[in-house]
Each structure stands twice: as structure tokens, then as C-alpha cells.
């Protein structure tokens, strides 16, 4: 708390300008009118206030707006945003994407802080869903944003928003998240032709089921090994050698280097060695000739 003291004669601020940087904390408190500050917030950013001085300015705004700042003030907070606590931000009602962009700009280049996370949460909840423009903005500032959401939160992403997603935005997503995003992407891109469709859907394939991978194998897509290695193991296991060869095209050579890693390792164990040999890759560990393959999952379903 800054002690209440009268403003010295002639020091009353008539506008927010650079002369204020020479004011002591108590002088700022006594001589700057909160309403004036609120109307001239856009000037604060251009003035090199110390962190202590910014604390005073924040205190003045808190007193003026105990229920939370109006958006007209929030939009011009600039570096003062870094002084806000998540509790402060929870009182705000941010509806403008421009306001969101302005505040994200202040935090640019840094990890997502609790303040930013709270701001985004408030904004998205206010909008009711994660629309394309919002997603575009958030992933531009935080490429990992999408993967920080829970599967439940992701379920509110409309398929139309998927167009804003770039491959790098999905780098840290786990299979549960891709399980939610893949069907949305499939829906969003359904009217594209073969090669264009594959380029767009590729990043989401970690959530694809077996039948979709089988369908892709018929389309000359030449999936690279990095994408193949991110596929769900349970979706890869039922693929035949011929299907994997068609799915990977010239990238099939890369299977040899990955033969000890999932899902390749587990897939090899499920294939007949004779079939693996036709790839000419030297893959070992398949089911030897003459062995009977029992599908235990089918047996359980029947019993």
C-alpha cells in the first residue's frame, strides 16, 4: 500500500507524459488522477516507468475499477499487463480479438505465463468455442497451445477452425488429443483431392484408425517415416505388408532403421516372415513359415 499524502503544489498531473518518470512513488499516487490514467493508458507504454512506478499505476486502476478493468483500459495495458495476477484477470471480460493480440504481444517470446493462460481461458469461454480466428492468433503466439488443451477442451474446437492449424502446432500433442482432432480434420478437409488432402491431414494422422490408413495406402501418398512412427500402434498392427509398402512408397526403406522402435517393432511381430522378406529390407522377427496365426481378440469375442 502507498501511504495517502497530498500532492505537492504544481505537481498535479494534467496528462500522462514523460515528466512522470521523475515522480517518487508517493507523488505518483498523490498527483495522478486514476480517471486520467484510465483515459490515457495508451501513453503509459511509451514512457520508461520503473517496475515500482508501474505498481503504483496498477494500484490506482485497481481502486478505480474494483470489479475489474473495462476493455478500453485492458486493450492499452501494455507492459502493465505483466503486473496483473490471474486473480485480476479473472475479473475481466475480454471480447475483442484485438485486445487479446495486444496483450499476447507484450508476453511474446516468453513461455505461457499463468496470467496469459488465464486471459486465454477467459477469452475462449467468453466466445463459447475456439473459433478459427482465435485459434489462428493463439497458435501464432504459442505453437504448442493446441496441445496444452485437454481432450475435453479440444472437443469444443469446430472443424472449420482446423484450417488454422499448422503441423508444428501439433508437435507436442499426445495420442488422446489427436484422437479428438483427427475426426475434425477429416471432416474439415473432406472435399480436397488426394494429394492435397494428404498434405493437410498428415499432421493429424496420429489419431487415424486402421481403416483410414488402409484407404490412404491405395492413394499413392508416400507417407514419410516420421509420420508413420507417430501413428497409433493399434491402428498400424492390422496393416498388411503390401499395405505398408503402398502407404510408405519410397520411404519404405526407412523401416529398417526403425525396426526396433514402436510401432514398427510390434508390426513386424505380427507379419509373416515370408511377407516381410518381399520388402527386401532384411526385417527379421516375423512369424515363421508354417506357423498358425490365431486372432485371440476374435476368440474372446466369440466366447
Amino acid at each position: 500500500e502507498v501511504e495517502k499524502t497530498a500532492c505537492p503544489s504544481g505537481k498535479k498531473a494534467r496528462e500522462i507524459d514523460e515528466s512522470l518518470i521523475f515522480y517518487k512513488k508517493w507523488e505518483l499516487e498523490a498527483c495522478v488522477d486514476a480517471a486520467l490514467l484510465a483515459t490515457q493508458m495508451d501513453r503509459v507504454n511509451a514512457i520508461p516507468f520503473t517496475y515500482e512506478q508501474l505498481d503504483v499505476l496498477k494500484h490506482k486502476l485497481d481502486e478505480l475499477y474494483p470489479q475489474g478493468y473495462p476493455e478500453s483500459v485492458i486493450q492499452h495495458l501494455g507492459y502493465l499487463f505483466l503486473k496483473m495476477s490471474p486473480e485480476d484477470i479473472r475479473k475481466w471480460n475480454v471480447t475483442s480479438l484485438e485486445t487479446l493480440k495486444a496483450l499476447l504481444e507484450v508476453n511474446k517470446g516468453h513461455e505461457m505465463s499463468p496470467q496469459v493462460a488465464t486471459l486465454i481461458d477467459r477469452f475462449v469461454k467468453g466466445r463459447g468455442q475456439l473459433d478459427k480466428d482465435t485459434l489462428d492468433t493463439l497458435t501464432a503466439f504459442y505453437p504448442g497451445y493446441l496441445c496444452s488443451l485437454s481432450p475435453e477442451e479440444l472437443s469444443s474446437v469446430p472443424p472449420s477452425s482446423i484450417w488454422a492449424v499448422r503441423p508444428q502446432d501439433l508437435d507436442t500433442c499426445d495420442p488422446r488429443q489427436l484422437d479428438v482432432l483427427y475426426p475434425k480434420a477429416r471432416l474439415a478437409f473432406q472435399n480436397m483431392n488426394g494429394s492435397e488432402y494428404f498434405v493437410k491431414i498428415q499432421s493429424f494422422l496420429g489419431g487415424a484408425p486402421t481403416e483410414d490408413l488402409k484407404a490412404l495406402s491405395q492413394q499413392n501418398v508416400s507417407m514419410d517415416l516420421a509420420t508413420f512412427m507417430k501413428l497409433r500402434t493399434d491402428a498400424v498392427l492390422p496393416l498388411t505388408v503390401a499395405e505398408v509398402q503402398k502407404l510408405l512408397g519410397p520411404h519404405v526403406e526407412g523401416l529398417k532403421a526403425e525396426e526396433r522402435h514402436r510401432p514398427v517393432r510390434d508390426w513386424i511381430l505380427r507379419q509373416r516372415q515370408d511377407d516381410l522378406d518381399t520388402l527386401g529390407l532384411g526385417l527379421q522377427g516375423g512369424i515363421p513359415n508354417g506357423y498358425l496365426v490365431l486372432d485371440l481378440s476374435m476368440q474372446e469375442a466369440l466366447s
Partner: antibody, heavy 119, light 107 residues
Framework: EVQLLESGGGLVQPGGSLRLSCAAS????????MTWVRQAPGKGLEWVSG????????YYADSVKGRFTISRDNSKNTLSLQMNSLRAEDTAVYYC????????????WGQGTLVTVSS | DIQMTQSPSSLSASVGDRVTITCRSS??????LAWYQQKPEKAPKSLIY???SLQSGVPSRFSGSGSGTDFTLIISSLQPEDFATYYC?????????FGGGTKVEIK
């Protein structure tokens, strides 16, 4: 370490025959498709012939079709190229090459053996 | 037969330079393209397969891109040991064919 060692090159007269061999080590030979590639002096690379993992399928460039025969002996880890009716334009260094997959690129090359067709 | 056309046929560059070699096929070959490096009196060495996948043990300064009919090999920062002849090759269909080669010489 994969090693491919060619032998059988030398000087031969036009119309003559020569048999090139390639001994493979450091790999399970029977698992890989193999091929022969040649390079005439001062020229670029030319694919000559290829053979599948089992030896059941063979492929030839038009320039050697009917004159050259590729074969493999998986029990001895050897690849062969029987060259008949040799011509001056067959003069080249012949490389034995392993394919990275049955339909793959050429990932390991031997050091080559020189075949000179001249009278 | 599929013709492979490489350009330039030769180029002069200095250590540290970024070098770009292009290869064009007479018909679409998807990503069925490989790049090889050959030094004088030596056998070729595989650099890249499937148009953009680096062979194991090949330095990351080499990269490949393209699909269909137009392909590129880039050496991001030329090293003394990179002065050699580079060949592209299609293995989409028989007969398998090579480009004419690009000789990278010291400026």
C-alpha cells in the same frame, strides 16, 4: 559393415564374353535386391540390370537385353553378371550395388571392376 | 523411358557456400528419387532416398526436396570434402535412370 567386392573384369575382344562376380559380406544377402550399374570412362552412371530377393525376377536395360544375364546364389552370397556378345560401348567400370529395399534406392556400392572391350 | 535432366552440369563454389542442384524428370515420379555423390576414382555414395530422406551417416548439411517432376539437392554450407560429382536417379519405373551429373568444383 556391408562390403561388396566385384571381380572378373578385364580386357576382352568385341563379340567375346566375360562373367562378373560380386561377393557380399556384412549383410544377410538373401534379404536384399541387387543390381549392376556401369560407368563408361569420363561418363555418367547407367543402370544395367537388377534382380529380386529370390532371383525370380530380373530386369535389364534395353542396351544389354538378350546379351547379359544376371543371377544370384543366395547360399554363397554372390551376384553374377554373364556378359556375352560384348561391344566397344560396353567398356566401363561395373559396380555391384545393393538396393535399400526390393524397390529401393542404391544404398551400398562396391568399388567396381573395369571391363574393356577392344580389339 | 524416363529422362532425368540435371542442372547445372557444373558449378564453381567456395567453402561455406550454399549450393543448389536441380533435377527434372520427363514424367511424374512421385518421391521415387535418390541423390548420389561420387568422387574421382571412387564408387558413388548414397546421400538421399525418397527425394528428401537422408541416408544414415550423411551429414545434415545435405537436404533434398521436391516431388512429381522437380527435385532439388541443397548443400547448406559446402565443406572441402563435398567437392565431387552429384547424380540424381529415379527408381519409380524400369529402366532405372540417372541424371547426367553435376560437378561441384572449387572456385
Amino acid at each position: 559393415e556391408v562390403q561388396l567386392l566385384e571381380s572378373g573384369g578385364g580386357l576382352v575382344q568385341p563379340g567375346g564374353s566375360l562373367r562378373l562376380s560380386c561377393a557380399a559380406s556384412g549383410l544377410t544377402f538373401r534379404n536384399y535386391a541387387m543390381t549392376w550399374v556401369r560407368q563408361a570412362p569420363g561418363k555418367g552412371l547407367e543402370w544395367v540390370s537388377g534382380i529380386s530377393v529370390s532371383g525370380g525376377s530380373t530386369y535389364y536395360a534395353d542396351s544389354v537385353k538378350g546379351r547379359f544375364t544376371i543371377s544370384r546364389d543366395n547360399s554363397k552370397n554372390t551376384l553374377s553378371l554373364q556378359m556375352n556378345s560384348l561391344r566397344a560401348e560396353d567398356t566401363a567400370v561395373y559396380y555391384c550395388v545393393k538396393r535399400g529395399a526390393a524397390v529401393g534406392s542404391f544404398d551400398y556400392w562396391g568399388q567396381g571392376t573395369l571391363v574393356t572391350v577392344s580389339s | 523411358d524416363i529422362q532425368m535432366t540435371q542442372s547445372p552440369s557444373s558449378l564453381s563454389a567456395s567453402v561455406g557456400d550454399r549450393v543448389t542442384i536441380t533435377c527434372r524428370s520427363s514424367q511424374g515420379i512421385g518421391s521415387w528419387l535418390a541423390w548420389y555423390q561420387q568422387k574421382p576414382e571412387k564408387a558413388p555414395k548414397s546421400l538421399i532416398y525418397a527425394a528428401s530422406s537422408l541416408q544414415s551417416g550423411v551429414p545434415s548439411r545435405f537436404s533434398g526436396s521436391g516431388s512429381g517432376t522437380d527435385f532439388t539437392l541443397i548443400i547448406s554450407s559446402l565443406q572441402p570434402e563435398d567437392f565431387a560429382t552429384y547424380y540424381c536417379q529415379q527408381y519409380n519405373s524400369y529402366p532405372l535412370t540417372f541424371g547426367g551429373g553435376t560437378k561441384v568444383e572449387i572456385k
